[in-house]
């Protein structure tokens, strides 16, 4: 029998800057029941506080509700593991809520094949921001990324949509069934999970020649152009 091993706080995430949750990995248990407690203080303060909510985030977690979440303040936190033989301490983690935002996936993903008589056919993709995020306050800028692939293909094609909530794509394989997903990230923070996949059947007569692959803003009514490989590479590695 041994004291517990050193725990490790490995992740903190906020869905919207209003609340956040941190998770830890327990250390080795030493063969005895082990009790974990998370304590924290805000930078510039000396008063230590215990985790306000060990339940909401699931096992080995601490959830900070609205009344415990402050913007522009760094939280310094540590997990203590104790059993009958002694105690162990995690390294301290410094957390600024601004930089740990991971939004929920975008909502209401809709995909349509548009085949106007006088213009080239295209795939039109539209979505809504996640509900927990209030974009009106100006606290948030959400960036979006779309991925799509034929149902049986292994590789995804990825497009960066910037701040738009709709996007048009021309270069598709006729007759194929495509999966389409979208995700979002704040200007500082983490990509959301991908939204549930939406399926779309591309008609067999969805054709285009090479000259049509570059689409002008005018053709799209002021919408996003297909981005270059360079742009795609730059934006994809956030």
């Amino acid at each position: 029998q041994l004291p517990p091993g050193k725990p490790e706080i490995f992740k903190c995430r906020s869905p919207n800057k209003e609340t956040f949750t941190c998770w830890w990995r327990p250390g080795t248990d030493g063969g005895l029941p082990t009790n974990y407690s998370l304590t924290y203080h805000r930078e510039g303060e000396t008063l230590m506080h215990e985790c306000p909510d060990y339940i909401t985030g699931g096992p080995n977690s601490c959830h900070f509700g609205k009344q415990y979440t402050s913007m522009w303040r760094t939280y310094i936190m540590m997990v203590n593991a104790t059993n009958q033989m002694g105690s162990s301490f995690s390294d301290e983690l410094y957390v600024d809520v601004t930089y740990i935002v991971q939004p929920d996936p975008p909502l209401e993903l809709a995909v349509e094949v548009k085949q106007p008589e006088d213009r080239k056919p295209y795939l039109w993709i539209k979505w809504s921001p996640p509900t927990l995020i209030d974009l009106k306050t100006g606290w948030f800028t959400l960036l979006y990324e779309i991925r799509l692939k034929p149902e049986k293909a292994a590789e995804w094609e990825i497009h960066f949509a910037g701040q738009q909530t709709e996007f048009k794509i021309l270069s598709l394989h006729p007759g194929q069934k495509y999966l389409v997903q979208v995700r979002c990230k704040p200007d500082h923070g983490y990509w959301s999970a991908w939204s549930p996949a939406t399926f779309i059947q591309i008609p067999s007569d969805f054709t285009m020649n090479d000259e049509q692959k570059l689409i002008s803003e005018e053709d799209l009514g002021g919408e996003q152009k297909l981005i270059s490989e360079e742009d795609l590479h730059h934006h994809h590695h956030h």
Partner: antibody
Amino acid sequence: EVQLVESGGGLVQPGRSLRLSCAASGFTFDDYAMHWVRQAPGKGLEWVSGIIWNSGHIGYGDSVKGRFTISRDNAKKSLYLQMNSLRAEDTALYYCARDSGRYQSYFDYWGQGTLVTVSS
Amino acid sequence: DIQMTQSPSTLSASVGDRVTITCRASHIISSWLAWYQQKPGKAPKVLIFKASSLESGVPSRFSGSGSGTEFTLTISSLQPDDFATYYCQQYNTYSRTFGQGTKVEIK
């Protein structure tokens, strides 16, 4: 520049007491846990005792439990080791070492040591 | 307490050699392991922490690997300045323990 300077070592008879001090400079002392590590002549390193930043947790090696007491004075930027009931096997070079964090991590800075000799 | 066992106790090598020192823990310690270098008459100096992270200012010829109970320190190309004694130390529990040391000497 981080500096740790040990003092208080010397020749002492078995059963007697000695108090070691470690004066810290070049860093915010109360942001770090501190430790005593010893090395008997020609031997390896042995962790003696440690204390977290606010003295809220203290630990001792099995060989010194009940005889040695670690303490710190953050205002004076000092670490202490009160050694009672000294034995011949406590003869060693005693190092003061800084933990790399406030609680439990590796030792990133060491003093040059103070020699304690227990002999009649 | 957790026992740390280093091997070999002594290692004879030449400048330019690749040198590997092993450290075994008696219980799982995750990656909470540090390696120190000590030269005669000097205090130890940390080389590696968290099993494989190189301490700032330490030459890149030093590297660490392992997790759980088996760990290694590797010096990719031994330099004259590297002849010293090396210690592993676990900090998985508050009571720290060191290996008995490995002396790297000139062949």
